[in-house]
């Protein structure tokens, strides 16, 4: 071995590549006296010859496939056939040849695949099998599809897992996979040994078949159900069901109402809990999810609209116990007295809330019954017969039947018969003067008193004064109050004054009565009254433009990114500058003339969002008053947090020593916005080095499997380095540490003695 | 079985770059890390650093870090180191090896800067 | 970095000669992380013995190792000619991996 041919008797291993013809010796084992001959047995498969002499030689090929390993003997003899060295272990390793092709185990495959499933989820695998030694590159297999049928537009809806076998649909397959365009497909897969590497590598092919079936994962059509149903309840309203069995249902409400009535069970059908009531809520909008067994989305959400469907349970309602309304005396026939307004809360534009008006007693009947009119759907009252004598009749009472299609409500109006209003009301002043006060003057204070008369009868519409500013104030910023036993004004202040807008204002009174003039009477002069207001100027501090700016920016602006801006103005005319106030994370500046915002470090929308501080705007100069508005900021997600470990896996052992090789489950996890997909982390080693002692595989989008590849682990901690990356954009890698303890074990727990080491781990593999 | 095919030797002057390459065959390219070490002329194993071809990740000695850069070329199945500012320091025989059972080795590319 | 310390750094020896190469490692390393080459002038490192103890694929059962922790060694159990040679322990325990300063076989 390595060059040398001959040496004493002792154990050796040979290694010979199968396939081979004989071409030279194995070896020439050398007689120490007294040994004179030598004799071999074992697995020689009458392959294996020595002569006597010690040339040990084999006579035919060897087949690697037929025997591994030739565990053979050699012993040296004496003169007399007695053994008197060895025998010794002498092992031919036989060494792999690729003389075997691959072939799959079947000849067809057939399968089935959902239609928007996602991509890389394997549905089906085929498998072959090469009896040349997997550990070499003549029994690693490769996979590939050879041809799609039909293709359409040159894509390809399938992909194989070279090393697996593992079918699955590619991004475009999962789109556009619809069994209503085409039910089949037909691929041919081909393996090859050599890893697919080799053009001397042998090949099979096989057929697969593959059914697309329907996504059944749809939103079901919007459901309508009557409200205040008095069907035993929970009642089922409508189903959704993942395409595979075992999935976890759930209802997600997206408006976080204080009573949800709606409940999902693990078949998918969802229902109604309790009654509706449309005039509470008429309409509801939640999600279906469906989830795995470890509570993670297995598809987008379906989004579910329940309508409430409107029954007439409302009766209609007056405005009020009794309507009072008012007729002069001398109104003519057809005049509109007044509408009643009735309500029912049913909804509307239906029969279920369309009323009608009818008048069903009037009293008293004098002069006669029947006097008064209502249109039959507006509910507007008129004169209909005579004008009226309030020396005769005063006052009449109306019972008014209001009714929708099922229900009737009596309402009440009292018709009050009033003195014809042939008067105008006077002021006591035409001229009220100047007043002047501060621009600062409290908003609601009384500022003057005004006074007017009017000679019809007292405490009717024709003598009630309503007082209207016409002229001279159309900001609004004062407001006139009457007192209705005195008719006195009472001039308010509404608004804030203002020097800087209206130092000077000429304002002009009207007196009007809310019942109209007889014909031929007339507003005059007497009914009109004026006066000046002076403001006088006060410092005021600025004024924001808002009470609250508000922006929204991605959380990776680069630094110096204007993020907002906000804008204030001094009544006086003065410059403004600008200061932010509790920026506590020190995260902006603000352009002390402009007001613009920019940011000044790096934004994390993981510390919170909307991040708020207040912008200050101060006088420059003057008495350097100032103002607080608020200012949001709204950070948008973006993938800027690696993934880390989802918990402390600080205990994780393996009972030393291993008798087989071993694995466990992690779980990974990020501070990034995941909305409904969940993340899809893909996981591998952080070395190289790790390579021959470990394995990480994915399980799904959040957990991994760690394996070890061997058994020989020392009774001590490891700790393995694992990439995770979140396929985010950019993409994210966090590498972690998981450390892995080997220990004697008791009772499936590792066994420290008494203060050997602290931190003892507890989660057994 | 698996082979890593090196260019026997490369003569760079100082203060350039040069790109080494290492192709891999016998094996799926991507599913083991390729690592680089230099061997001075009568001196001992120093490891350079290695790469992960599945996604190009790498890790360096911190000796080599800019020194240095690994890349990979999957449809090609080839890893390169780039070497730059080169100096006779550099001078060397470079291997590349795959870690993951530890025994197989480029024949190595010996790298001689010299104007 | 890990630093690993061979002994002896030459030494010449004749056929049929046991041989011992140590390899002391500066912190202590699992024995799964050791591993032996030779090299042979002009030749690419060859992989001798992985995890310390168990022989690579090819190697005559004369070689073996042994050790744990920080101390570890190498054993020829008879010399033989072919066997001149240089040869590197090297750990893959932490990054940077690194090889111990070799020891030159020679044949006395």
């Known amino acids: 071995q390595e060059g040398k041919f001959s040496g004493p008797l002792k154990p050796m291993t040979f290694s010979i590549y199968e396939g081979q013809e004989p071409s030279q010796i194995i070896f020439q084992f050398k007689a120490n006296p007294p040994a004179v001959t030598f004799e071999l047995t074992g697995e020689t498969d009458n392959i294996f010859v020595i002569e006597r002499e010690g040339l040990l030689y084999y006579n035919r090929a060897l087949d690697r496939e037929t025997r591994s390993t030739h565990n053979l003997q050699v012993a040296a003899l004496d003169a007399n056939g007695i053994i008197v060295e060895g025998p010794v272990p002498i092992t031919i390793k036989v060494k792999d040849i690729n003389d075997n092709r691959p072939t799959f185990l079947q000849s067809k495959y057939e399968g089935s695949v959902r239609q928007n499933s996602r991509p890389g989820k394997p549905f089906l695998y085929v498998n072959a099998t090469d009896l040349d030694d997997p550990a070499t590159p003549n029994g690693q297999l490769y996979y590939q599809i050879v041809i799609q049928l039909p293709m359409i537009n040159n894509v390809m809806y399938f992909q194989i897992n070279n090393k697996t076998g593992a079918i699955s649909l590619t991004r475009e397959g999962s789109q556009e996979l619809n069994p209503a365009k085409n039910p089949s497909y037909n691929l041919v897969i081909s393996v090859k040994d050599m890893g697919g590497q080799s053009e001397n590598s042998f090949s099979d092919t096989t057929s697969v078949d593959i059914i697309v079936t329907e996504n059944i994962w749809k939103a079901p059509k919007p459901v309508e159900m009557v409200e205040n149903s008095t069907d035993p309840h929970p009642i089922k309203i409508t189903q959704v069901r993942w395409n595979d069995p075992g999935a976890q249902y759930s209802l997600v409400d997206k408006e976080k109402l204080p009573r949800f009535p709606f409940s999902i069970d693990q078949e998918g059908d969802i229902y109604v809990t309790q009654p509706l009531d449309r005039e509470e809520k008429d309409a509801y909008v939640f999600y279906a999810v469906a989830k795995d067994e470890y509570g993670k989305p297995l598809s987008y959400p379906l989004e579910i609209h329940v309508k409430v469907k409107d029954i007439n349970d409302n009766p209609p309602t007056c405005p009020s116990p009794v309507t009072v309304f008012e007729v002069q005396e001398n109104e003519r026939l057809g005049n509109s007295i007044g509408t009643l307004t009735a309500h029912d809360r049913d909804e509307e534009n239906t029969a279920n809330s369309f009323l009608n008006y009818r008048i069903v007693e009037q009293t008293p009947k004098l002069p006669m019954d029947g006097l008064f009119l209502i249109q039959t759907y507006a509910g507007m009252l008129q004169l209909a017969k005579q004008s009226l004598k309030k020396q005769d009749t005063p006052q009449y009472n109306l019972t008014i039947e209001v009714s929708d299609k099922d229900f009737k409500t009596l309402c009440f109006v009292q018709i009050n018969v009033i003195d014809i209003n042939d008067q105008i009301p006077i002021f006591e002043k035409s001229d009220y003067g100047n007043l002047t006060l501060a621009e600062d003057t409290n908003i609601g204070s009384t500022i003057l008193t005004i006074q007017a008369t009017d000679a019809d009868e007292p405490f009717t519409g024709s003598s009630k004064i309503l007082y209207h500013i016409i002229k001279g104030d159309s900001e609004g910023r004062l407001g006139v109050d009457t007192d209705p036993h005195t008719n006195t004004g009472y001039v308010i202040i509404k608004k804030p004054l203002d020097f800087e807008t209206a130092a000077v204002s000429n304002i002009v009174f009207k007196a009007e009565n809310p019942e109209p003039l007889v014909f031929g009477v007339k507003y005059n002069a007497s009914s009109f009254a004026k006066f000046t207001l002076i403001v006088t100027d006060v410092n005021e501090a600025p004024q924001f433009s808002q009470h609250v700016f508000q922006a929204k920016v991605s959380e990776d602006v680069a630094i110096g990114t204007k993020v907002g801006n906000v804008t204030a103005k001094d009544p006086e005319g003065l410059d403004i500058s600008y200061s932010l106030r509790g920026d506590t994370r020190g995260w902006l500046k603000i352009d002390h003339v402009t007001g613009e915002i920019f940011s000044v470090a790096p934004l994390d929308r993981e510390a919170g969002s909307p991040y708020r501080v207040q912008v200050v705007a101060t006088e420059v100069g003057g008495s350097s008053l100032s103002s607080v508005s608020e200012f949001h900021l709204i950070l948008m997600d973006v993938n800027d947090n690696p993934p880390r470990l989802a918990k402390d896996y600080t205990g994780l052992f393996f009972c030393h020593p291993l008798s087989a090789p071993g694995s466990l489950i992690f779980e990974a996890t990020d501070d990034d916005q995941h909305l409904f997909r969940g993340p899809h982390f893909t996981f591998s080693l952080g070395s190289g080095s790790l390579q021959n002692d470990w394995e990480v595989s994915k399980i799904n989008g959040t957990h991994a499997r760690l394996s070890t590849r061997h058994t020989e682990f020392e009774e001590r901690e490891y700790v393995v380095l694992i990439r995770i990356n979140d396929g985010g954009r950019p993409p994210l890698e966090g590498i972690v540490s998981l450390p892995v303890t080997f220990c004697s074990c008791v009772e499936g727990s590792c066994f420290r003695p008494a203060g050997h080491q602290t931190g003892i781990p507890t989660v057994g593999m | 079985q698996v082979q890593l095919q090196q260019p026997g030797a490369e003569l760079v002057k100082p203060g350039a770059s040069v790109k080494l390459s290492c192709k891999a065959s016998g094996y799926t390219f991507t599913t083991y890390w390729m690592h680089w070490v230099k061997q001075r002329p009568g001196q001992g194993l120093e490891w350079i650093g290695e790469i992960d071809p599945s996604d190009s990740y790498a890790n360096y000695n911190q000796k080599f870090k800019g020194k240095a850069t690994l890349t990979v070329d999957k449809s090609s199945s080839t890893a390169y180191m780039q070497l730059s500012s080169l100096t006779s320091e550099d001078s060397a025989v470079y291997y590349c090896?795959?870690?993951?059972?530890?025994?197989?080795w480029g024949q190595g590319t010996t790298l001689t800067v010299s104007s | 970095e890990i630093v690993l310390t061979q002994s002896p750094t030459t030494m010449a020896a004749s056929p049929g000669e046991k041989i011992i190469i140590t390899c002391s490692v500066s912190s202590s390393i699992s024995s799964i992380h050791l591993h032996w080459y030779q090299q042979k002038p002009g030749f690419s490192p060859k992989l001798l013995i992985y995890?310390?103890?168990n022989l690579a694929s090819g190697v005559p059962t004369r070689f073996s190792g042994s050790g744990s922790g920080t101390s570890y060694s190498l054993t020829i159990g008879t010399m033989e000619a072919e066997d001149v040679a240089t040869y590197y322990c090297q750990q893959g325990s932490n990054l940077p991996l690194t090889f111990g300063a070799g020891t030159r076989l020679e044949l006395k």
């Open positions: 090896a795959l870690y993951y059972g530890y025994g197989d």
């Open positions: 995890r310390t103890s």
